[in-house]
């Protein structure tokens, strides 16, 4: 059984953890006090695994052409995606683009855009599709 | 009230080795996690590392790795902060203090003024 | 050089007020709520004024309070008094789990 203290001056919940205080378990970030952890507050930072930190890493915010796909939690960051009609190619650090609005000439869509891929096309005689 | 007391100046060349001590009274010597910061003669302050007084575990940042060592006696609530291969810059107050809740320091020591000088 | 930017100095009459900026970057200053402002005295250990962007201890004059904006904290005295005559140091946690502090700044209360 854990064994939970109450800071009053900062009203953040706090247990005690181990008896040396070497790490603090996923959603949660070391005390002050040695042998005990905070828990980090929803919506405002996580952590994802055990940890040795002295605050939780602060969530992320979307930006301004993305939409959340997934809200942070104390232990995930918030998942962020762009918005219906744009996309951005997998693990790429740039804007948001806007999708295709369709195939060229002699082309036929075999795939939608998605959050993360722009439209699909393939040669109308052809089974081999590529990306535009 | 908690107190935390260092030991004296002291006087050091080149490429000795200098070793601060920071006796706590006033509380547990264990309740808290311990820091170590200096400032050079009319300079800022700089962070040195922590301290955890339970397991005797202890991280500084990467300037001062392989050269500072954190260690402590329990029995006399005492703390010590080890600094080797000193050069001139080194020279400066070395001030122990314990971590204060939302990631502060206080209280502090009176501060240890290490010069080094050939 | 300070990771964290302080004007070297200010000054300010008897009952004036002062601001002093501490501007870092998203890995510290702005990225959390742990930033701290110390007063240190000639000869003396730094003292803490005011923890977590605005809250000063028990025992710190309300004549002190602070405000953080992006990544830019502020520390205001008003009410100068001679006493404040110091130096002040911002510090803040960053996302390396280490401490940052500024170059300070020398406060003098004029006249």
């Known amino acids: 059984a854990t064994i939970k203290l109450h800071d009053q001056s900062i009203g953040t919940q706090q247990w005690e953890h181990s008896p040396l205080g070497e790490l603090c378990p996923p959603g949660s970030h070391r005390s002050e006090r040695p042998g005990a952890c905070n828990r980090c507050t929803e919506g405002v930072g996580y952590t994802n695994a055990s940890n040795n930190l002295f605050a939780c890493l602060p969530c992320t915010a979307c930006k301004s052409d993305e939409e959340e796909r997934s809200p942070c939690t104390t232990t995930r960051n918030t998942a962020c995606q762009c918005k219906p009609g744009t996309f951005r190619n997998d693990n790429s650090a740039e804007m948001c683009r806007k999708c295709s609005t369709g195939c060229p000439r002699g082309m036929v869509k075999v795939k939608d855009c998605t959050p993360w891929s722009d439209i699909e096309c393939v040669h109308k005689e052809s089974g081999n599709g590529h990306n535009i | 009230e908690v107190q935390l007391v260092q030991s004296g100046a002291e006087v050091k060349k080149p490429g000795a080795s200098v070793k601060v001590s920071c006796k706590i009274s006033g509380d547990s010597f264990t309740a808290y996690f311990i820091h170590w910061l200096r400032q050079a003669p009319g300079e800022g302050l700089e962070w040195m590392g922590w301290?955890?007084?339970?397991?005797?575990?202890?991280d500084s940042p990467q300037k001062f790795h392989g050269r500072v060592a954190m260690t402590r006696d329990t029995s006399i609530s005492t703390a010590y902060m080890e600094l080797t291969r000193l050069a001139s810059d080194d020279t400066a107050i070395y001030y122990c203090?314990?971590?204060?809740?939302?990631?502060?320091?206080?209280?502090w020591g009176q501060g240890t003024l290490v010069t080094v000088s050939s | 050089q300070s990771a964290l930017t302080q004007p070297a100095s200010m000054s300010g009459s008897p009952g004036q007020s002062i601001t002093i900026s501490c501007t870092g970057t998203s890995s510290d200053v702005g990225g959390y709520n742990y930033v701290s402002w110390y007063q240190q005295h000639p000869g003396k250990a730094p003292k803490l004024m005011i923890y977590a962007v605005t809250n000063r201890p028990s025992g710190v004059s309300n004549r002190f309070s602070a405000s953080k904006s992006g990544n830019t904290a502020s520390l205001t005295i008003s009410g100068l008094q001679a006493e404040d005559e110091a130096d002040y140091y911002c510090s803040s946690y960053t996302s390396s789990n280490t401490w940052v502090f500024g170059g300070g700044t020398k406060v003098t209360v004029l006249g």
């Open positions: 301290f955890n007084p339970i397991s005797g575990t202890a």
């Open positions: 203090a314990r971590q204060h809740h939302s990631n502060t320091f206080d209280p």
